[in-house]
């Protein structure tokens, strides 16, 4: 199985929503659906993993219902016909409340975690490789849908390349053999992370392109600052880290640090007071030489949202901002697995972190 990188998230998509899962489902793929159950209208919502956009072939239909005390229905639809329902009589969702819903695809089943607790496992009734689309409908408002790929080593060449600054727009994938889309970063020597413009189907017959990271603010989730989290397993070639957030209107500076013990292996420091993006490494409290060159103007703007994508390769880190390659930073600390802590601080509000 080839590593296909982590797909860019869908942010604040309108409901009903249908979006492509690039490369289809793979063993180990994790999909997070974050949103809020609407308190007013409707008594149901559903997340569907399906083939195409028609809704006739749904490998996994996850359907919370606020009826009869609350329960969740899981099912499969083949050629328009539903199979037998599997019901879980505990309702982990609450009307009017936010939720964090996470799906893990494994060889035998889907595992579903709700708000940090394993909720249900649903054994595959049809081959999951057929799934190429996720859809969400019903009484729910979405903050984002994000994707995190398994940590795997490529066994075949990764995707073809395109210029760094050129995101790619794909139409809905036709049924049958899937075409692998090109990526933003080149394939050699490590697997890539794709950053693309998603084509989203908001409702039947309405097709429109939306940037992978549109400039939007989110009421939640709000991360406390400074934000510190462990990077499980540390860095390794093909590892990617995604952050999105909003720069505060009066921002002076913020930083994203990748740390190894007391050392800062990579310090990414946008400075609005200097109109610069400074990169550096700190070893034993001593800073090295700064790197400041940029291929274009300062990509971070006060008061606007942003995404930062950090891809670790064998010799360097590649950094993309808002889906566009910005710079490479050659490793100064080369023991990558020990770089296992992410620290974010300064004048931003974080809305999403994926490590």
């Amino acid at each position: 199985m080839a590593f296909s990188g982590s797909q860019a998230p869908y942010l604040s998509p309108a409901v009903p929503f249908s979006g492509t899962i690039q490369g289809g489902l793979q063993d180990g793929l994790q999909i997070t659906v974050n949103g809020t159950v609407l308190s007013s209208s409707g008594t149901r919502f559903a997340v569907n993993f399906q083939t195409g956009f028609s809704g006739n072939d749904i490998a996994f239909h996850f359907n919370p219902r606020f009826e009869d005390g609350g329960y969740v229905v899981c099912n499969t639809r083949q050629n328009g016909s539903w199979g037998p329902e599997e019901r879980k009589t505990h309702m982990p969702f609450q009307k009017g409340m936010p939720f964090d819903l996470c799906f893990l695809v494994q060889s035998s089943d889907f595992k579903v975690m709700v708000n940090g607790i394993l909720f249900v496992q649903y054994f595959h009734r049809v081959p999951f490789h057929r799934v190429d689309t996720i859809s969400v409908n019903g009484s729910v408002q979405l903050s984002y849908i994000s994707f995190q790929n398994p940590r795997t080593v490529p066994v075949q060449p990764a995707f073809s390349t395109v210029p760094f600054s050129q995101p790619v727009c794909f139409p809905p994938r036709p049924r049958g053999r899937r075409q692998k889309p090109p990526g933003v970063w080149p394939a050699n020597p490590a697997p890539i992370t794709q950053t693309v413009i998603h084509t989203v189907q908001s409702a039947p017959g309405q097709m429109f392109s939306t940037p992978a990271i549109p400039p939007m603010m989110y009421p939640h989730p709000a991360y406390p600052m400074p934000f510190i989290t462990t990077i499980l397993g540390g860095l390794y070639p093909s590892k990617s880290i995604l952050l999105s957030g909003t720069v505060l209107p009066s921002a002076q500076r913020f930083h994203i640090n990748l740390c190894s013990g007391n050392h800062i292996a990579f310090h990414l420091n946008p400075r609005f007071d200097e109109n610069a993006v400074v990169r550096n490494t700190q070893i034993d409290n001593s800073w090295g030489s700064e790197e400041r060159s940029l291929p274009r103007k300062m990509p971070f703007v006060r008061g606007q949202s942003f995404s930062v994508w950090i891809l670790c390769e064998a010799h360097c880190l590649k950094v993309a901002v808002d889906g566009q390659h910005l710079f490479e930073y050659y490793h100064r600390l080369r023991n990558l697995p020990t770089i296992n802590r992410l620290e974010v601080g300064g004048d931003i509000q974080l809305t999403h972190v994926q490590t």
Partner: antibody, heavy 123, light 109 residues
Framework: EVQLVESGGGLVQPGGSLRLSCAAS????????IHWVRQAPGKGLEWVAY????????SYADSVKGRFTISADTSKNTAYLQMNSLRAEDTAVYYC????????????????WGQGTLVTVSS | DIQMTQSPSSLSASVGDRVTITCRAS??????VAWYQQKPGKAPKLLIY???SLYSGVPSRFSGSRSGTDFTLTISSLQPEDFATYYC???????????FGQGTKVEIK
Amino acid sequence: EVQLVESGGGLVQPGGSLRLSCAASGFTVSSSSIHWVRQAPGKGLEWVAYIYPYSSSSSYADSVKGRFTISADTSKNTAYLQMNSLRAEDTAVYYCARYSTYSSKWVWGMDYWGQGTLVTVSS
Amino acid sequence: DIQMTQSPSSLSASVGDRVTITCRASQSVSSAVAWYQQKPGKAPKLLIYSASSLYSGVPSRFSGSRSGTDFTLTISSLQPEDFATYYCQQSYYDSNPITFGQGTKVEIK
């Protein structure tokens, strides 16, 4: 370094209240689920409650439902357990523990625990 | 509630012995099971997470396995520092999302 430190335990009369605190360092409580687990003298471990600040959700053991409230202040990186209508059978050492972090949801286990704080309910 | 029935409640063993502790879940809990070691007056320590994964820093003599709803903690060669109480714990969403086994006290023979 990840650390959890509980405080707020003590002697309280039946029907009284206590508020336990669990101060976290080395990670953010908003990216984890925080659990309270108690252990009565000479007994086993009993799960009490958990909070998942990331989506403002919580859950309670049947034995404490309606009496205990779990909360978190992400600006202080601290979780709390407000215990009301305390009974003799609530006497225990109360531990807070970190469950899965947001970036490693599929790791099922409580990897860091506090040292515990003793709550004694007695007249 | 999902019950975790742990056995035995206590056992006596010698240094170098192979020790096996089992937990049976009252319904499927997937692999959402952890094992902990607790010594008197101390907080529990995570040994095994996700049924069979060894937590970092834990000696390799500890291992976990799963067969359906049966979960096993094995200590391949008991060491003096292993005399303690061991607990299994499941985390599968139910009326109580977390439950512990009753504990197994491993004593010196």
